[in-house]
């Protein structure tokens, strides 16, 4: 569910949502960790509907969902919860 | 202006059969979750079930799976509720709702709900 | 199933008053909380969404807030129109679930 992505591309994010999604509703997860040309952290949510959400890396309900995501990652063995892509 | 106008309540016999319809207008159904719910004369809400827009998804109330189908017709802006095997307990106003999921994630349309009425 | 406990199930209060109300998830929710307003009669109508949210076109007189467990509702100024059951819901996870509604009298 969750990707964390590094790459050389300027920031990707022009408008940011605080707005809770449920999980059902999600297909993928992205994080674009800061640098590279873009100065922040950016959390782009791919949705089931095809759509694309930038999500504000401060909404607190992201912040649970990945610590709940990197506690069932660590303890379970199927696919690692973290896909690292690095050019 | 959205619309969601519902039919096909009324009086059914204990272990008979019911189909609920919902008609959309005003949105682009194909594109939206929907959900149904109920309320029991005097009582609170109860959610029913939801389809996701091809019907690939379709989630139900435990309690209410075996006896209960939700389909829609995207051609036709419609969503159904086939109930089946009713009982006394199935008596309340049904609701069908949009499930939305592009920007409140919560049912922000409802129709105007449709009495079903399980006598003999 | 994740149920909501909403308390009181009813309240008397006077125009202009500030009125809360609480709604309990068993277990963490997130933010994926919902508030509607039910007049007798009508369709639920949404209010509040992802918990602090308020629906469009909905008075600022409105508000939730909470995360985890615990949510809460409130009416800064209470007004003859407000007069409705109100319930909460979460949309966290299937089955999507209720709070029993607290129904809300002028005094």
């Known amino acids: 569910v969750l990707e964390v992505y590094y790459t050389s591309l300027r920031c990707r994010c022009v408008q940011e949502s605080s707005v809770f999604i449920p999980r059902r509703f999600i297909d993928r997860i992205q994080i674009l960790p800061r640098g590279n040309g873009c100065p922040r952290k950016e959390i782009i949510v791919w949705k089931k509907n095809k759509s694309i959400v930038c999500v504000d890396p401060q909404a607190e309900w992201i912040q649970r969902m990945m610590e709940v995501l990197r506690k069932r990652s660590s303890s379970t063995l199927p696919v690692p919860v973290f896909k690292r892509k690095i050019p | 202006e959205v619309q969601l106008v519902q039919s096909g309540g009324g009086l059914v016999q204990p272990g008979g059969s019911l189909r609920l319809s919902c008609a959309a207008s005003g949105i682009d159904f194909s594109r939206y979750w929907m959900s149904w719910v109920r309320q029991a004369p005097g009582k609170g809400l109860e959610w029913v079930g939801e389809?996701?827009?091809?019907?690939?998804?379709?989630n139900y109330a435990p309690s209410l799976k075996d006896r209960f189908t939700i389909s829609r017709d995207n051609a036709k802006n419609s969503l159904y509720l086939q109930m089946n095997s009713v009982r006394a307990e199935d008596t309340a106003v049904y609701y069908c709702a949009r499930q939305d999921d592009y920007e409140y994630y919560a049912m922000d349309y409802w129709g105007q709900g449709t009495t079903v009425t399980v006598s003999s | 199933d994740i149920q909501m406990t909403q308390s009181p199930s009813s309240l008397s209060a006077s125009v202009g008053d500030r009125v809360t109300i609480t709604c309990k998830a068993s277990?963490?929710?997130?933010?994926?909380v919902a508030w509607y307003q039910q007049k007798p009669g009508k369709a639920p109508k949404l209010l509040i969404y992802s918990a602090s949210y308020r629906y469009t076109g909905v008075p600022s007189r409105f508000s939730g807030s909470g995360s985890g467990t615990d949510f809460t509702f409130t009416i800064s100024s209470l007004q003859p129109e407000d007069i409705a059951t109100y319930y909460c819901q979460q949309y966290y996870s299937t089955p999507l679930t209720f709070g029993g509604g607290t129904k809300l009298e002028i005094k």
């Open positions: 389809i996701n827009p091809d019907s690939s998804t379709i």
């Open positions: 277990q963490d929710v997130n933010t994926g």
